[in-house]
Interface confidence: low
């Protein structure tokens, strides 16, 4: 730990004296205490030496020297008294704020240690400190109130006897706050309310606070409602309640209701919406498109929101087909909030047989309502190329399946190659109107494209390339001259 020169723990000087406090340490140090503006730091050794050329009672206090590099190494203190018969007290603060239950330090420091046995604490106006207030005097710190209470809030003066005469400090205002000094806690119940015209309703506005001095009102819009106030006192908290009870609600009762509670600290407000409807309702909506497209193997969640009053009594998710073989049990959850439900259907790694219609049905006193999703699966193209003579002419057939409907491009390339792009191709044909062989709902589209060649050219490779939003695929056909025969080679190329 650092060493202070002169050695302490206390130093007593007369007003007007020069006082130098030096802190000796291996590293840089920092002084803490009632320093500014009564001291100067020695420019030769900044941080380590404090000097005052003309000590006054305001220099009275505890000075601490701490090592900056290693605060854990500890610190050293010295308490300086500047004994001035004209000023028995040095006040380090005029106002002290603590939380109830804490120690409250009233920092009136005695300037002469010889006076410490005759000190006393009084309330301003010459009144004694409250009998239940437990306090003691520390010459270095001042008067310390143990377990300060709200009742201890007051202006205090410190007194001592100097040469048989009373010397009194100026006042220190002690403010003792509650553990939670804040506006009242409020609750407005329910947080949302719907009623059919003619039904009964209750809105309860309640507030709790540690002190009794607070107010609570219930408003509809800007209108303060004249409702009797019920009060209670529980576990040392005051509770005030205004409850609006309506036997048969009408449309004029609807609106925004506010619960407002206020005290000296501030105001808290809670609001809720009261809706009056003509009859029961059940509305089903989805933020998603009702026409869903996903790739085979993907997962998705179908989400439906229901706004309903009164409560939904029954609901169910149903698969309406068209594929009824190999059906998994539907997995869904329901989340409920006030007058609002969220229904979620989980479709995990969907298979071909799970495409189709999904139907949510819900019922309350308003009747039944439903919503249908159509789930179409996307498939990458699958391609097959065949050759057939038609009326003595060579024709290549490209059969393609997939969803969405794939596009078809033919390419003629020189040589026996298994790769060919448009830049290398001798000819390119885009089939903009292939023949649709099959187009069933929720299933793959099957199309056929024909390439009438006339006579297959020797040493050429013909490619049928297909593409959709999911992927692409191609297959080639080679013309091999073996007399009059045409041969489809064994190898074929498929690129998903």
């Amino acid at each position: 730990a650092p060493v202070i020169e002169p050695s302490g723990p206390e130093l007593v000087v007369e007003p007007g004296e020069t006082v130098t406090l030096r802190c000796v340490s291996n590293g840089s140090v920092e002084w803490d205490g009632p320093i500014s503006p009564y001291w100067t730091l020695d420019p030769e050794s900044p941080g380590s030496t404090l000097t005052t050329r003309n000590a006054t009672f305001k220099n009275t206090g505890t000075y601490r020297c701490t090592e900056l590099e290693d605060p854990m190494a500890g610190s050293t203190t010295i308490h300086l008294y500047v004994k001035d018969p004209a000023h028995s007290w040095n006040l380090l603060a005029q106002e002290v704020t603590v939380v109830e239950g804490q120690e409250a330090v009233l920092p009136c420091l005695i300037t002469d240690p010889a006076l410490k046995d005759s000190v006393s604490l009084m309330r301003e106006g010459g009144r004694q400190v409250l009998r239940k207030t437990v306090y003691f005097f520390s010459p270095w710190r001042g008067f310390i109130i143990r377990k300060a209470k709200v009742l201890d809030s007051n202006t205090y003066v410190c007194k001592t006897m100097v040469n048989g005469r009373e010397s009194t400090s100026t006042g220190i205002w002690l403010k003792v706050n509650r553990v939670h000094p804040e506006p009242p806690q409020i609750k407005l119940e329910p947080s949302k309310l719907v009623r059919i015209r003619g039904e009964a309703a209750q809105i309860v506005c309640s507030a709790t606070n540690a002190e009794v001095g607070f107010n609570v009102i219930l408003k509809r819009g800007d209108t303060k409602l004249e409702i009797p106030l019920n009060s209670d006192f529980q576990d040392n908290y005051y509770k005030k309640v205004r409850a609006l009870s309506l036997n048969a609600v009408d449309f004029q009762d609807a609106g925004i209701y506010s619960c407002v509670a206020s005290n000296d600290v501030g105001t808290r407000t809670a609001t809720m919406n009261f809706q009056v409807v003509e009859s029961a309702y059940l509305n089903l909506t989805s933020e998603q498109s009702l026409l869903q497209e996903v790739s085979v193997g993907d997962s998705l969640i179908l989400t439906v929101h229901a706004d309903a009053y009164p409560s939904i009594q029954h609901y169910n998710w149903t698969y309406l087909g068209p594929f009824f073989e190999d059906q998994r049990k539907l997995e869904f959850i329901t989340q409920r909030a006030i007058y609002r439900y969220t229904f979620k259907l989980f479709l995990n790694r969907v298979k071909a047989s799970e495409a189709g219609q999904y139907f949510l049905m819900a019922q309350n006193k308003a009747g039944w309502n439903n919503l249908t999703f159509e789930l179409t699966l996307r498939y990458p193209p699958e391609v097959s190329v065949t050759w057939m003579p038609v009326n003595g002419s060579d024709v290549l057939f490209c059969d393609v399946s997939g969803y969405p409907q794939p596009s078809v491009t033919w390419m003629e390339c020189r040589g026996h190659t298994d790769r060919c792009d448009e830049a290398q191709a001798l000819q390119v044909w885009n089939d903009t109107h292939p023949e649709v062989l099959s187009q069933k709902p929720f299933d793959k589209v099957i199309i056929q494209s024909q390439l009438p060649i006339g006579t297959l050219k020797h040493n050429m490779t013909y490619f049928c390339k297909t593409h959709n939003s999911v992927g692409n695929s191609s297959q080639y056909f080679r013309a091999v001259s073996l007399g009059q025969s045409k041969q489809l080679p064994d190898e074929s190329l498929f690129t998903p």
């Epitope: 009998r131 209470k149 009742l151 509650r178 553990v179 540690a210 529980q234 576990d235 040392n236």
Partner: antibody, heavy 119, light 106 residues
Framework: DRQMVESGGGLVRPGRSLKLSCAAS????????MAWVRLAPSKGLEWVAS????????YYPDSVQGRFTISRDNAETTLYLQVDSLRSEDTATYYC????????????WGQGVLVTVSS | DTVLTQSPALAVSPGERVTISCRAS??????IHWYQQKPGQQPKLLIF???HLESGVPARFSGSGSGTDFTFTIDPVEADDTATYYC?????????FGGGTKLELK
């Protein structure tokens, strides 16, 4: 010095009534919340009643509500507990205590008085 | 009502450190208070608001915790500390006490 002395206990038959007293001295009785807490044999402490400094507000747990009545006389610096329809489970040592003004804990306790309910 | 659970009994030797726990069935913030009751005597407040030492109580006694878990510590234990120690909550209504922990010295 603060003192609280309970009296009025003893052996009572089930169904009968009893009034306990607590004479307080050495402190400003009228400034304090007061309470009764009991300790039944082989059981823990149980708070049974509290009263505000003025006597305007009284507080009871549900377990004794309607059978126990707490009251005070600030002029006589005395606290009372009226116990009606006594049951065997009311057998306990009853303590009067000062309740802290800001929180419901009990900072000073009397010596206690034993109430035995038995036929 | 809020239930406070304490271990029923402990036996320690003088000079040792002893810790008594109090668990609440629901949060009680820091409104837990500790009492000592010696045989044949009235209870005495030792700690209030979880950690505040009542004036006149030796610094050997201390308390800590908030929410639902609280600890009361005596360090070091003295022969005169033989007693039953109760925790009490005042956050929820009604105020309730724990069942007490009987501390015996070996």
């Amino acid at each position: 010095d603060r003192q609280m002395v309970e009296s009025g206990g003893g052996l009572v038959r089930p169904g009968r009534s009893l009034k306990l007293s607590c004479a307080a001295s050495g402190f400003t009785f009228s400034n304090y919340y007061m309470a009764w807490v009991r300790l039944a044999p082989s059981k823990g402490l149980e708070w049974v009643a509290s009263i505000s400094p003025s006597g305007d507000n009284t507080y009871y747990p549900d377990s004794v509500q309607g059978r126990f009545t707490i009251s005070r006389d600030n002029a006589e610096t005395t606290l009372y507990l009226q116990v009606d329809s006594l049951r065997s489970e009311d057998t306990a040592t009853y303590y009067c205590a000062t309740r802290h003004y800001g929180y419901s804990f009990f900072d000073y306790w009397g010596q206690g008085v034993l109430v035995t309910v038995s036929s | 009502d809020t239930v406070l659970t304490q271990s029923p009994a402990l036996a320690v030797s003088p000079g040792e450190r002893v810790t008594i726990s109090c668990r609440a069935s629901e949060s009680v913030s820091t409104l837990i208070h500790w009492y000592q009751q010696k045989p044949g005597q009235q209870p005495k407040l030792l700690i209030f608001l979880a950690s505040h030492l009542e004036s006149g109580v030796p610094a050997r006694f201390s308390g800590s915790g908030s929410g639902t878990d609280f600890t009361f510590t005596i360090d070091p234990v003295e022969a005169d500390d033989t007693a039953t120690y109760y925790c009490q909550q005042s956050w929820n209504d009604p105020p309730t006490f724990g069942g007490g922990t009987k501390l015996e010295l070996k």
